[in-house]
Interface confidence: low
């Protein structure tokens, strides 16, 4: 089975998570992409997705999540603003390519959000709670009508080092199944 690695981000409440998921340019530029959470090795739950087909550099906002797909660079930029402790968890970017299974981009993101420093609101210089301006956006498309058990996996052990290439075929059928708590993808 494909082994997955994690990249850890430790941030304070109110800060912004800003990550970039690389993809194979020619193959996936206009494909619809999504940002998912997997809590404690549970089944992925889609939180936000780009439009279909994905628009170049067009920000899509769902709640506190902003996605921007840069076709020219082959990367999906994901920002989660005004982070809360409850946002802590394991995240991943996926590319939808129906009728095939969604294609998972490596590495997964392990987000740890801790309480900010006590003090006056906004006193933490890294806080984006009051200064971050979310660009005006419109989201025309719901996330895909597609849920894939194939990407359901246990979070890998911390020592895992093997990384699949972005355009490799993912087959996770032999990975232990998970307990599903935030219920469905």
């Amino acid at each position: 089975a494909t082994k997955l690695t994690e990249e850890k981000y430790e941030l304070k409440e109110g800060q912004t998570l800003d990550v970039k998921c690389d993809y194979t340019l020619e193959k996936f530029a206009s494909s619809q992409k999504a940002w998912q959470i997997i809590r404690d090795g549970e089944m992925p739950k889609t939180l936000a997705c780009t439009e279909r087909p994905s628009k170049n550099s067009h920000p899509v906002q769902v709640g506190r999540i902003i996605l921007e797909d840069y076709h020219d660079h082959g990367l999906l930029r994901v920002r989660m603003v005004n982070l809360q402790v409850e946002d802590s968890g394991l995240y991943q970017c996926v590319i939808y390519q129906p009728p095939k299974e969604p294609h998972m981009l490596f590495d997964r993101i392990r987000l740890v959000v801790t309480k900010g420093f006590s003090g006056t609101p906004g006193s933490n210089e890294n806080s984006t709670q009051n200064v971050y301006k979310i660009p005006p956006t419109t989201t025309k498309a719901l996330c895909p009508l597609y849920t894939s058990p194939r990407t359901v996996t246990q979070a890998p052990p911390k020592s895992t080092a093997d990384v699949s290439t972005p355009d490799s075929e993912i087959n996770l059928t032999n990975v232990t199944d998970i307990i599903r708590v935030p219920v469905f993808n």
Epitope: I37, M43, K45, T46, L47, A48, V62, G63, R64, I65, M80, Q84, E86, D87, P99, E101, L142, C143, L145, Y146, T147, S148, P149, R150, V152, L172, T173, N174, V175, T176, D177, I178, I179, R180, V181, P182, V183, F184, N185
Partner: antibody
């Protein structure tokens, strides 16, 4: 179009087992979890569990742990739900169900299978 | 488990009048990251499986008449039928999809007065 077709009604004695099938068509069977929900006569809906048709992995409601077994045969796109040690209060209509959107509700349902447990 | 409590148990409304069904969850089903409530509403007619009407608490499923609307957030939700039609006579259920196991409300029977 997506269709879930279930097996016919069953009459069982207390202590016996029943196995209900749910044949899927119109979509990639291994691409979506299959859920089972039951409804006793005149009562509400009760989630029993799900199976990942791709891996065969399952999750069962605590109430049914040890009595329910969910399996699948991918070669014929069919999911199965077996309930053992039947009691009279297991008399119910058993449904298989599938989401369309992820985490957003069951858009597709089987027609239901009535299981009657009576001595 | 999250407990879903529906009220009233039954409701009699005149044709063309508004029907309102309430659903309360024992804990919030709002996912703060995307500001979505993982709550669905179903309609079930006798001898038929349930039919999905609303998901994300307020988004109508494709093909559902616009007289059906859902509202609410967190723990308190409402399904409204703005102008009751004869074909709306059914039992209505809410269901949370936020935490496993997914749980249903006890149902509300809607009849014509």
């Amino acid at each position: 179009q997506v269709q879930l077709v279930q097996s016919g009604a069953e009459v069982k004695k207390p202590g016996a087992s029943v196995k209900v099938s749910c044949k899927a068509s119109g979509y990639t069977f291994t691409g979506y979890y299959m859920h089972w929900v039951r409804q006793a006569p005149g009562q509400g809906l009760e989630w029993m569990g799900w199976i990942n048709p791709n891996s065969g992995g399952t999750k069962y409601a605590q109430k049914f742990q040890g009595r329910v077994t969910m399996t699948r045969d991918t070669s014929i796109s069919t999911a199965y739900m077996e309930l053992s040690r039947l009691r009279s209060d297991d008399t119910a209509v058993y449904y298989c169900a599938r989401e369309r959107h992820s985490s957003l509700g069951y858009a597709y349902w089987g027609q239901g299978t009535l299981v009657t447990v009576s001595s | 488990d999250i407990v879903m409590t529906q009220s009233p148990d039954s409701l009699a409304v005149s044709l063309g009048e508004r029907a309102t069904i309430n659903c309360k969850s024992s804990q919030s089903v709002l996912f703060s990251s995307n500001n979505k409530n993982y709550l669905a509403w179903y309609q079930q007619k006798p001898g038929q499986p349930p039919k999905l009407l609303i998901y994300w608490a307020s988004t109508r499923e494709s093909g559902v008449p616009d007289r059906f609307s859902g509202s609410g957030s967190g723990t308190d939700f409402t399904l409204t039928i703005s102008s009751l039609q004869a074909e709306d006579v059914a039992v209505y259920y809410c269901q949370q999809f936020f935490l496993a196991p997914p749980t249903f409300g006890g149902g509300t029977k809607v009849e014509i007065k």
